[in-house]
Amino acid sequence: LLDTRQFLIYNEDHKRCVDAVSPSAVQTAACNQDAESQKFRWVSESQIMSVAFKLCLGVPSKTDWVAITLYACDSKSEFQKWECKNDTLLGIKGEDLFFNYGNRQEKNIMLYKGSGLWSRWKIYGTTDNLCSRGYEAMYTLLGNANGATCAFPFKFENKWYADCTSAGRSDGWLWCGTTTDYDTDKLFGYCPLKFEGSESLWNKDPLTSVSYQINSKSALTWHQARKSCQQQNAELLSITEIHEQTYLTGLTSSLTSGLWIGLNSLSFNSGWQWSDRSPFRYLNWLPGSPSAEPGKSCVSLNPGKNAKWENLECVQKLGYICKKGNTTLNSFVIPSESDVPTHCPSQWWPYAGHCYKIHRDEKKIQRDALTTCRKEGGDLTSIHTIEELDFIISQLGYEPNDELWIGLNDIKIQMYFEWSDGTPVTFTKWLRGEPSHENNRQEDCVVMKGKDGYWADRGCEWPLGYICKMKSRSQGPEIVEVEKGCRKGWKKHHFYCYMIGHTLSTFAEANQTCNNENAYLTTIEDRYEQAFLTSFVGLRPEKYFWTGLSDIQTKGTFQWTIEEEVRFTHWNSDMPGRKPGCVAMRTGIAGGLWDVLKCDEKAKFVCKHWAEGVTHPPKPTT
């Protein structure tokens, strides 16, 4: 059986696959997924290994029309480095010489300057090029190699291994060499895989059942450390509760060097955030941190300094802490917008069982603003999801120059932010450089400001506008209002009407359904339309909603189904990557972010059309 990293190299023109007959003969044969000799896999960013021989594809020289055969894998050899060129060409790195079928006289696969159909290769059974099944470095744990990546294949006691092994062990623990010759270099680490006993790599907090892995002997950059945690279905550490910090202070007390945690300010337009999307509500900075020096965007926990946090350059090499298991957040169920009949008094705006109102003109200090909201039967607003924030920005009449009190504050316990309405903190969205909590002026209250409505801590005594929120009163069955310019069941936003397509459909089916409604799969022109759509679909239980974006027409170039320029994107992390496909919006914790899916997957969708009676604004000229 093929494991997910292995593939057959297929030439569509001949309908045949590459076959490693022997190390000196790499030819083609009728494709057979059970033949070991036809299985290959990437073993570094640029090397392809034959699974049968545990040797790498290479050439004797970078010249036209030489045979491609198998060599002992050598990550430094220029003659074993391959790269995908445009579309389905595979070439030797840095040259216009391609992996080629050969010809009638030449049965062997050859290196050739021609880029025609005989030089075009796909993964058998797919339409993808060979790089779509690319190499993913596997970071080791413990051992003696400072967390370096596995080197496949590696030699141990004169035998080659292309995977983690338990050779030399009687307990089944899986390990790998971190250089190609363990026998000479003696460098190794344990693999971040599940095996009997691997749970002893983790410390479980008996109070919360959350597990932590302290990798104090590793030396990785922040991004590498994060990848290592993710390879174990975990994330870099987030700390949202005082108890959690206390537990980790104890766990790391015998250590001295800094350890990466998930806190970072890598997002271009927002502030400090946890990589696992936990809310940043508890602060434990080392005095003098976070320093405002550019580039110091990642955070380490300092065991030698009472486990306090310090921001550093992300390329520094440190140990790290991973976290997995039940989140430390209280379970707090936010009702989906469609589940709650929402009736609000005049001048209040309904959303997901609550009513909201901006008080912009009567500026008040935080304490007085809170009193006013409570007199009106509510509280300063709490915000629990990106959808709720996007509702406030896109539909409450929020303005880019607003600075408005919300209910978040750390008045009760310093450096521990809570909502004034007592609801749990499940979400935060800080402005770049925030929360700054400047010591020379007590910044215990929080405002929403700027075009995106992100947050900043502020001295509570400033007179500002504020946002109130209260529970709505249910009044029997909800009356479906027909919005002006839109048909029944459609929702209006600015000049457009939107409708959720409730049938699970492929991208093509969804597009057709929208067309049948004299509409099209939604385009997303800017941050504000994105905010509206996030609040429109983000709380729904389905995972994805199709948009009109895809690279069906030209691989690698994403276009809307209607002739409109792509002027705004909102990709999820690691997207769009190299995957061709169609774009859907995520819901839930990654609400609104765009993922590339296979176009024949089934999802719900959003249709869009011009509202009636709206004058089309002129198209922007470029």
């Epitope: 003696n144 030399g168 062990r169 623990w173």
Partner: nanobody, 119 residues
Framework: DVQLVESGGGLVQPVGSLRLSCAAS????????MVWYRQAPGKKREEVAA???????NYADSVKGRFTISRDNAKNTVYLQMNSLKPEDTAVYYC?????????????WGQGTLVTVSS
């Protein structure tokens, strides 16, 4: 690297008792199992008792009910309490630790301690 030191062997009369201990030291991350073996003169080495990191135990049929294996995780030490000893228990007793350490090899052996059961 990893060192194992056994102690507690000696001469004992039949039906008497002895307590063997085996202490592991060195660069050990965790000990997944500790096992006692014995080898009588002219015979093959045989497993006597084993204990895992989680505390599960296993005994050879010939010692069940007479021998008890236990461990002290904090001290990286395993004990073998031997009661109702018989002359056929005479052997060199070896301790093996299955460890996670700074080499990929897992099995480390002690030098052995001699137990003689004789009147």
């Amino acid at each position: 690297d990893v060192q194992l030191v056994e102690s507690g062997g000696g001469l004992v009369q039949p039906v008497g008792s002895l307590r063997l201990s085996c202490a592991a030291s060195g660069s050990i991350f965790t000990i997944n199992a500790m096992v006692w073996y014995r080898q009588a003169p002219g015979k093959k080495r045989e497993e006597v008792a084993a204990i895992t990191r989680g505390g599960s135990t296993n005994y050879a049929d010939s010692v069940k009910g007479r021998f008890t294996i236990s461990r002290d995780n904090a001290k990286n030490t395993v004990y073998l309490q031997m009661n109702s000893l018989k002359p056929e228990d005479t052997a060199v007793y070896y301790c093996k630790a299955v460890v996670v350490t700074t080499t990929p090899y897992s099995d480390y052996w002690g030098q052995g301690t001699l137990v003689t059961v004789s009147s």
